[in-house]
């Protein structure tokens, strides 16, 4: 059986301030079993954005119905996107455990933030 | 109670090199950043570089680049740093230090290794 | 790389004392950022993380405030046993790097 592999099929996605942001993300595979995790950057000051197992992620949405045993889409979308949100956002799938442990990360998506488009009234 | 046991006190030659080991013992290696810090003697602290043991994913001060190689054995719970290429400005006390696998404030730098003295003399 | 300058670099104080040291980052780190204590020959020990938690066990006469770029330690009532080297240390992004340090020694 071919390994899992994590896909990020989006090198770049590019948002208006305000706007919501969808980062695409799908597994390969449903084996090995365990949560996936979406973290801004890489290294060890990466953080946290969404958690599929636990945790209050009050910006972040699942776009499908993660939690479906059978589901192999975890793409997410983040509402009222600021110029602070850019940045690299990696998928990464967890081996289930104790603890989880990571097993692999998608490519990442760079986010960018355009600024929010003014709205000119023009009086006759 | 989570420990971070360091390798003895080493005296180097000038232009050789040297291997420090570090033993995680009481949580699991594998959840964790291991990072290595610099102490030259009467100084402060400087940060060398990290490994995350998971996948050996390594982040460094580009200072220390060249310098410092660090490497991990999973199956041991040991982190390892080697020091190549030694001259005078290279001894210093080493600690160990680590972090979660990812930003958790509490997680950051709580437990240190007791240190290894390196000290580069002909 | 983020720089931090902490000042003082060294200060006489006596028992009782209220001590103040600071830490100012090159660019904002948020409230990434810790605090440690140094004795000599010790490692150091974590004092308060995340600018402003004590770390469990530390005496409640230690505290830190701050954000963005400007950062307090502050010793409410100096006891015999703080006497050491305090460091600040950001964790907001790699390289990490650490205050020069504060060296508290008895007046």
């Known amino acids: 059986e071919e390994e899992l592999q994590v896909i990020q099929p989006d090198k770049s996605v590019s948002v208006a301030a305000g706007e919501s942001a969808i980062l695409h993300c799908t597994v390969t595979s449903l084996i090995p079993v365990g949560p996936i995790q979406w973290f801004r950057g890489a290294g060890p000051a990466r953080e946290l954005i969404y958690n599929q197992k636990e945790g209050h992620f009050p910006r972040v949405t699942t776009v499908s119905e993660s939690t479906k045993r059978e589901n192999m889409d975890f793409s997410i979308s983040i509402s009222n996107i600021t110029p602070a949100d850019a940045g690299t956002y990696y998928c990464v799938k967890f081996r289930k455990g104790s603890p989880d442990t990571e097993f692999k990360s998608g490519a990442g998506t760079e986010l960018s933030v355009r600024a929010k488009p003014s709205h000119h009234h023009h009086h006759h | 109670e989570v420990q971070l046991v360091q390798s003895g006190a080493e005296v180097v030659k000038p232009g050789a090199s040297v291997k420090l080991s570090c033993k995680a013992s009481g949580s699991t290696f594998t959840s964790y950043w291991m990072h290595w810090v610099k102490q030259a003697p009467g100084q402060g602290l400087e940060w060398i570089g990290a490994?995350?043991?998971?996948?050996?994913?390594?982040t460094y001060n580009q200072k220390f680049k060249g310098k410092a190689t660090l490497t991990v054995d999973k199956s041991a719970s040991t982190a390892y740093m080697e020091l190549s290429s030694l001259r005078s400005e290279d001894t210093a006390v080493y600690y160990c230090?680590?972090?979660?696998?990812?930003?958790?404030?509490?997680?950051?730098?709580?437990?240190w290794g007791q240190g290894t003295l390196v000290t580069v003399s002909s | 790389d983020i720089q931090m300058t902490q000042s003082p670099s060294s200060l006489s104080a006596s028992v009782g004392d209220r001590v103040t040291i600071t830490c100012r980052a090159s660019q904002d780190i948020g409230s990434r950022l810790n605090w440690l204590q140094q004795k000599p020959g010790k490692a150091p020990k974590r004092l308060i993380y995340?600018?402003?938690s004590l770390d469990s066990g530390v005496p409640s006469r230690f505290s830190g405030s701050g954000s963005g770029t400007e950062f307090t330690l502050t010793i409410s009532s100096l006891q015999p046993e703080d006497f050491a080297t305090y460091y600040c240390l950001q964790y907001a992004s790699s390289p990490f790097t650490f205050g020069g340090g504060t060296k508290v020694e008895i007046k």
């Open positions: 490994i995350y043991p998971v996948n050996s994913d390594t």
């Open positions: 230090t680590r972090s979660f696998y990812y930003s958790l404030d509490a997680a950051w730098f709580v437990y």
């Open positions: 995340a600018t402003s």
